[in-house]
């Protein structure tokens, strides 16, 4: 008669290696009497002998995956017992390998000259797959504006119209290599105003000739603004040359007045515009224009239509070189970010930036711009809006938007005058005000925001002021 | 410990002032936004003021715009609440209350302290 | 403002029994562009403070017991303790956020049958 023996494992279990969708065995091999009972456990969890996975075989000594998974991936042992002695263990690791697989591929992408492209590029694999990207027939090169980033996605700053062509990504590793299919990158270019109508200081009835090109695909346009309506008087010329536009106007001046050059190309269903501003003083107001930072003027843009007043002069800051272009610019690329903050801050950070960017203007001989009031901007940061302000500060930017988007500045709070030390020397947000005959929810400013879905703020109810509290920053 | 202590509250005659004060302790007081809440005896919770973090930013009910004015100290970590011509209908328990950053919805409260206006 | 209107009032129920509280307010709280819904549940104990039990209608603050659950959208909205402990008896009030002023429910009183 046998003496029982307890279990002693005599092959220990080893790394095993395998494919996705391939079998992967380990062998645990027992030398015990009485025959043991042997059972396996994945990280330290017991598998099932019924779970249809696996097989399990030669008394328990052969565990098989049957088609391996990428979620297999770990730590495998066997457990001999049969009561004789202890339970004895032997542990081995399986490392799932797989060829380079894009999860994500690119797509197609119409990009605006001067922005940023980013073309997807996403895998899998084990050892993780390298990521390069070719362009037309050969290996793109990274350089300061292109770059594959590190997941696998290429991102092209300010984009330019060489940048367009046919794309694709290559992923690889010691497996094998995976290619995406060719995608097309579009540069749109919009219209650009390529030379700017200069400034004039005249005598009175002088004849001046404003000058004013531009180009863009397709070629734009030109229309002039006198003051912010349509020229009344004066002759334009034009003429077409490679894509570029040249327009010109004649003036005969009787009085001073700021000139606007228009360009305007289509893209599909949307309308690209530039524009270029030139005064035209008479020459006795000439000291007086020079000390302005900017001008006076209608607003004309759509964007901020809703929220600021109607018929409102604002100021246009010249330090721009196109200023109402440029602020329009500016918060039109801010305004696709509001859609993603809360109900509550949306309406107010719109009031706020839309008050900010083109502040409200007094002509006079020197047109000022009147800031916003602190007590609504620190509503706004600190009420509305903590939430994203708060996050926009952690990123050590002065925006209210996402690192990596246009950001948009905002004001400084702290640095903005006090309605209560001197009401005339700051301009109120009545969307953040008390008033009683005040409408009850934000008007819609674009078709995408319908009113329905505007709720109520301080302004808009007969509950709320914004109050003299003296204690601020 | 996260908390919230509120002192001040009596009894007073109609017409009467009371000032209220809220002690925070536990968190940054200075970045958040603080409301009082009030509930009269055996009646629903009434929101009743706020002030932004700074102290710079302040909005009221309109049951006591004029005569309820709300402020801080943030070098003491205190909360106030400086109530004058008060009526009858004051009478409540008064709560401080902070304000979850960037929401209205209220996640740390006060115990109350209970004002009553009667003659 | 939005009023906030809470059935029912007061109601009884048995010790590991289910307790369901509606709130219905006269506008939606659902604000589409990040689909949340602006309500909040609060628990008021006999002679204490309001306690914050649930915000954006289902997420359950720290430390408040798995058995409090909110679901609803848009206007109509419930609180729910699916089994009934005697430290359950309170006050419940829903309140919205939505827009300002935030207001309140009457409240519903929970009692032990």
């Known amino acids: 008669e046998k003496l029982p023996k307890a279990p002693v494992i005599t092959t220990p279990l080893e790394t095993v290696d395998a494919l996705v969708e391939e079998v992967a065995t380990f062998m645990c091999a027992v030398e015990s009497y009485p025959q043991p009972e042997i059972s396996w456990t994945r990280n330290k969890i017991l598998i099932k002998l019924f779970d249809t996975r696996y097989s399990i075989r030669e008394n328990g000594q052969l565990l098989t995956i049957l088609s391996v998974e990428d979620s297999d991936d770990g730590i495998y042992c066997c457990i001999a017992n049969n009561g004789v002695g202890g339970a004895v263990e032997s542990c081995g690791a399986l490392q799932v390998k797989m060829k380079p697989k894009i999860t994500r591929p690119p797509i197609n992408v119409k990009i605006i000259e001067g922005l940023k492209a980013v073309l997807p590029c996403t895998t899998m694999g084990n050892p993780k797959p390298s990521v390069s990207w070719i362009k037309g027939d050969n290996a793109l090169r990274e350089n300061s504006r292109i770059a594959v980033l590190e997941s696998g996605s290429l991102r092209i700053h300010n984009v330019q119209k060489e940048d367009a062509g046919q794309y694709r990504c290559v992923a690889k590793n010691s497996l094998g290599t995976a290619y995406s299919k060719l995608v097309k990158l579009e540069v749109e270019v919009f219209a650009r105003i390529l030379r700017a109508p200069e400034s004039h200081n005249v005598t009175f009835g002088s004849f001046v000739t404003l000058r004013c090109t531009a180009i863009g695909i397709p070629v734009p346009t030109i229309s002039w603004i006198e003051n912010g309506n349509a020229v009344s008087s004066g002759s334009i010329q034009e003429s077409v040359k490679d894509r570029v536009i040249d327009s010109r106007l004649q003036l005969f001046i009787t009085k001073p007045g700021l000139y606007t050059c228009i360009a305007t190309n289509k893209h599909g269903e949307k309308f690209s515009t530039a524009k270029a501003a030139a005064t035209v003083s008479i020459a006795e107001w000439s000291k007086s224009q020079k000390d302005s930072q900017g001008y006076c003027a209608q607003y004309r843009g759509e964007v901020c239509d809703a929220v600021l007043a109607k018929d409102a002069l604002v100021f246009f800051n010249t330090s721009y070189r196109d200023p109402e272009d440029a602020q329009e610019l500016l918060i039109h690329t801010a305004w696709n970010e509001l859609k993603a903050v809360s109900p509550l801050c949306r309406p107010a950070a719109e009031a706020l930036l839309c008050n900010h960017l083109f502040q409200e203007c007094s002509p006079g001989v020197v047109p000022t711009p009147m800031p916003i009031c602190r007590e609504y901007c620190l509503a706004v940061k600190e009420l509305f809006c903590a939430k994203e302000w708060q996050a926009m500060e952690g990123k050590a930017h002065r925006g209210l938007y996402r690192s990596g988007m246009h950001l948009l500045p905002v004001p400084e709070c702290s640095k903005l005058p006090s309605m209560h030390r001197d009401p005339t020397a700051c301009t109120r947000l009545p969307y953040l005000d008390y008033k009683k005959e005040n409408i009850t929810t934000f008007p819609s400013i674009t078709s995408s925001r319908p009113s329905a879905d505007i709720p109520n703020l301080p302004a808009s109810t007969s509950s709320f002021a914004v109050s003299p509290a003296y204690s601020m920053t | 410990e996260v908390q919230l202590l509120e002192s001040g509250g009596g009894l007073v005659q109609p017409g009467g002032s009371l000032r209220l004060s809220c002690a925070a302790s536990?968190?940054?007081?200075?970045?958040?936004?603080m409301s009082w809440v009030r509930q009269a005896p055996g009646k629903g919770l009434e929101w009743v003021s706020v002030?932004?973090?700074?102290?710079?930013?302040?909005y009221y009910a309109d049951s006591v715009k004029g005569h309820f004015t709300i402020s801080r100290d943030n070098s003491k970590n205190t909360l106030y609440l400086q109530m004058n011509s008060l009526r009858a209908e004051d009478t409540a328990v008064y709560y401080c209350?902070?304000?979850?950053?960037?929401?209205?919805?209220?996640?740390?409260w006060g115990r109350g302290t209970l004002v009553t206006v009667s003659s | 403002d939005i009023v906030m209107t809470q059935s029912p009032d007061s109601l009884a129920v048995s010790l590991g029994e289910r307790a369901t509280i509606n709130c219905k307010s006269s506008q939606s709280v659902l604000y589409s562009s990040n689909n949340k819904n602006y309500l909040a549940w609060y628990q008021q104990r006999p002679g204490q403070p309001p306690k914050l039990l649930i915000y954006w209608a289902s997420t359950r603050e720290s430390g408040v017991p798995d058995r409090f659950s909110g679901s609803g959208s848009g206007t109509d909205f419930t609180l729910t303790i699916s089994s009934l402990q005697a430290e359950d008896v309170a006050i419940y009030y829903c309140?919205?956020?939505?827009?300002?002023?935030?207001?309140f429910g009457q409240g519903t009183k929970v009692e032990i049958k």
């Open positions: 002030i932004s973090g700074s102290g710079g930013s302040t």
């Open positions: 309140q919205q956020y939505y827009s300002i002023p935030p207001t």
């Open positions: 209350a902070k304000k979850e950053l960037g929401d209205w919805y209220f996640d740390l």
């Open positions: 536990g968190f940054t007081f200075n970045s958040s936004a």
